[in-house]
């Protein structure tokens, strides 16, 4: 399963689309910056088996897909870019699911790292809560877009380490 290679390209495309989605100058949103507590430690460890690592990445992309699939998101971002972004994420999710199925027969370890997946879920809960508290304002969405771009970049480093392990 050549997921890390294909996923890395998909990740890059998703980052480019996210970068293009900006609607207002981020300079005007500095006071809205927020620490969402990105679960860095879940992307630092080398202890994961490949299937477990993929399941954590899958959760992050699934949660991103969910976040940008809401009606509030549709009201904020340019529709064609949002559709391309969602399609890109969906393709990555499908690739990952196929890859995990392949890996299951190869590895003895559990398919999922439950604690890591829970940490990612809680991270996205904090993002959703922030958006709610900020009433889905344009600046709040800009901050979230910047945060997701950063988390994608950090997970890209994780994927590259995963590829080197192979």
């Amino acid at each position: 399963c050549d997921l890390p290679q294909t996923h890395s390209l998909g990740n890059r495309r998703a980052l480019i689309l996210l970068a293009q989605m900006g609607r207002i100058s981020p300079f005007s949103c500095l006071k809205d910056r927020h620490d969402f507590g990105f679960p860095q430690e879940e992307f630092d460890g080398n202890q994961f088996q490949k299937a477990q690592a993929i399941s954590v990445l899958h959760e992050m992309i699934q949660q991103t897909f969910n976040l940008f699939s809401t009606k509030d998101s549709s009201a904020t971002w340019e529709q064609s870019l949002l559709e391309k972004f969602s399609t890109e994420l969906n393709q990555q999710l499908n690739d990952m699911e196929a890859c995990v199925i392949q890996e299951v027969g190869v590895e003895e370890t559990p398919l999922m790292n439950v604690d890591s997946i829970l940490a990612v879920k809680k991270y996205f809960q904090r993002i959703t809560l922030y958006l709610t508290e900020k009433k889905y304002s344009p600046c709040a969405w800009e901050v979230v877009r910047a945060e997701i771009m950063r988390s994608f970049s950090l997970s890209k480093i994780f994927q590259e380490r995963l590829r080197r392990k192979e």
Partner: antibody, heavy 121, light 107 residues
Framework: EVQLVQSGAEVKKPGESLKISCKGS????????IGWVRQMPGKGLEWMGI????????RYSPSFQGQVTISADKSISTAYLQWSSLKASDTAMYYC??????????????WGQGTLVTVSS | DIQMTQSPSSLSASVGDRVTITCRAS??????LNWYQQKPGKAPKLLIY???SLQSGVPSRFSGSGSGTDFTLTISSLQPEDFATYYC?????????FGQGTKVEIK
């Protein structure tokens, strides 16, 4: 390794133009803003302005608006600070530094080594 | 623009001393405050961001506190390499502004 490497020291005459540079490496250049800071001899730090290299959106401190121009070329991961007509009072050390934009990360965590600009007749 | 005022502008201390530098903003800046150290002929170095977060690689003897308008940088036990000038900077709004600096000298 993250690095911001600035162009070398410059000696200029009043009225001359100048463009100094700051080249980023070891990170995604368009994911961080680049700020410029002036330090006149024996004085403190003065914030000049900032640029988002992803789209070249720029903001200046009122004190520097119209006095300098900040630009960037993302294709070569380089930010610039330029003057069209230098004055003796522009004599200073100029630093560039990266900023994470709206993402939650340390502000101005990496700095260039500084470019000394001397303006004298 | 938001004005940042540091005090004292300079201080003399001995190795091992506990040193406190304060920074006051002209309006509330929440916790969007950074502290930098600068040594002669060198670029500034980030010590503390978001008022109290220690930058990676910075010794734990440095700490920051405060929110709103009043902030403090503390060096719990001054070391020879800590003699330098320290600057605060607000990061909540453009233009970002620095304090005038506090020079920490050897007594």
């Amino acid at each position: 390794e993250v690095q911001l490497v600035q162009s070398g020291a410059e000696v200029k005459k009043p009225g001359e133009s100048l463009k100094i540079s700051c080249k980023g490496s070891g990170y995604s250049f368009t994911s961080y803003w680049i700020g410029w800071v002036r330090q006149m001899p024996g004085k403190g730090l003065e914030w000049m302005g900032i640029i988002d290299p992803s789209d070249s959106d720029t903001r200046y401190s009122p004190s520097f608006q119209g006095q300098v121009t900040i630009s960037a070329d993302k294709s070569i991961s380089t930010a610039y600070l330029q003057w069209s007509s230098l004055k003796a009072s522009d004599t200073a050390m100029y630093y560039c530094a990266r900023h994470p934009g709206l993402a939650w990360a340390p502000d101005f965590d990496y700095w260039g080594q500084g470019t000394l600009v001397t303006v004298s007749s | 623009d938001i004005q940042m005022t540091q005090s004292p502008s300079s201080l003399s201390a001995s190795v091992g001393d506990r040193v406190t530098i304060t920074c006051r903003a002209s309006q509330s800046i929440n916790r969007f405050l950074n502290w930098y150290q600068q040594k002669p002929g060198k670029a500034p170095k980030l010590l503390i961001y978001a008022a109290s977060s220690l930058q990676s690689g910075v010794p734990s003897r440095f700490s920051g506190s405060g929110s709103g308008t009043d902030f403090t940088l503390t060096i719990s036990s001054l070391q020879p390499e800590d003699f330098a000038t320290y600057y605060c900077q607000q990061a909540i709004d453009l233009p970002f502004t620095f304090g005038q600096g506090t020079k920490v000298e050897i007594k």
